[in-house]
Interface confidence: medium
């Protein structure tokens, strides 16, 4: 599962700044449906001491709540540990710091293991350009195209952005 995604080069600091969620995928569809635990949207990211800090937007009762999470570095350069609805092994699958980022998480919660992938972009007007890449990474990790949800503006808490 991890074999194709190796050794990021360059600094994590390049990932800092604003991002927009474009698509989600999971082998457990409930996780990314409205009200699902992983139906969350990236707002911004920063890096410090090799760890990734993210501000995410979580839809709550018609509003969007901003929550800060930290993914902690591990001995593997593209792998991070994240505690969110259980334990997550978070992998940076493919990154162009100026354009797009594809990550996936192996989530373990109450003895249940799930796979969730997330595509985010810097510029929403270019989101179509990165969907093929997301589809191909998803297929590599065992997620099918019909398990991908492409988000609309209404979905991704656009109104909650500063």
């Amino acid at each position: 599962q991890e074999g194709n995604h190796e050794e990021p080069q360059g600094g994590l600091e390049e990932l800092s700044g604003r991002w927009h969620s474009v698509a989600l995928a999971s082998n457990k569809s409930d996780l990314i449906k409205p009200w699902g635990h992983f139906r969350v949207f990236i707002h911004s990211m920063s890096a410090k001491d090799g760890n990734l800090h993210g501000d995410i937007l979580i839809p709550q009762d018609g509003q969007c709540e901003k929550v800060s999470l930290t993914a902690f570095k591990t001995a593997t350069s593209n792998k991070f540990d994240l505690e969110y609805w259980g334990h997550n092994d978070l992998y940076l699958a493919e990154v162009d710091p100026k354009s797009y980022l594809i990550l996936y998480m192996i989530n373990q919660y109450n003895d249940d293991t799930s796979l969730v992938a997330h595509l985010m972009v810097r510029d929403l007007s270019r989101q179509q350009d990165f969907l093929p890449a997301f589809e191909s990474v998803c297929e590599d990790i065992g997620l099918h195209k019909d398990q991908i949800v492409v988000l609309s503006d209404d979905d991704r808490c656009q109104g909650s952005r500063d």
């Epitope: 190796e6 990021p8 593209n78 940076l92 990154v95 890449a133 297929e139």
Partner: nanobody, 120 residues
Framework: QVQLVESGGGLVQPGESLRLSCAAS????????MGWYRQAPGEQREHVAT???????GYADSVKGRFTIYRDNAKNTVYLQMNSLKPEDTAVYSC??????????????WGQGTQVTVSS
């Protein structure tokens, strides 16, 4: 750095087929994903299709069901089989390769491009 050489472009009539090839040489061990972009005159570049080293594929909506991308790792070549071609498929098609994650635009390798013209 990876060197890419494309072939297979040409002039065809609507409804016909073409197969583009892109052969990679150089630091091919580092390739994670390969694919094709296209650009028509006066238009933005469009990501047409992509395939990972693990065989995962992705397509632009405009070509789904008509184009197929596949990769022959033994020959270090990626192919784009284009069926049911339409005049709007007319463009210069460029092959690209990106290294194993993390991919960075500055590290993309590009071919020189091959012209595909669909006209009656």
């Amino acid at each position: 750095q990876v060197q890419l050489v494309e072939s297979g472009g040409g002039l065809v009539q609507p409804g016909e087929s073409l197969r583009l090839s892109c052969a990679a040489s150089g630091s091919i061990f580092s390739i994670y994903r390969m694919g094709w972009y296209r650009q028509a005159p006066g238009e933005q570049r469009e990501h047409v299709a992509t395939v990972t080293s693990g065989g995962g594929t992705g397509y632009a909506d405009s070509v789904k069901g008509r184009f197929t991308i596949y990769r022959d790792n033994a020959k270090n070549t990626v192919y784009l089989q284009m069926n049911s071609l339409k005049p709007e498929d007319t463009a210069v098609y460029s092959c690209y390769a990106i290294p194993k994650s993390w991919s960075r635009t500055s590290e993309y390798s590009w071919g020189q491009g091959t012209q595909v013209t669909v006209s009656s």
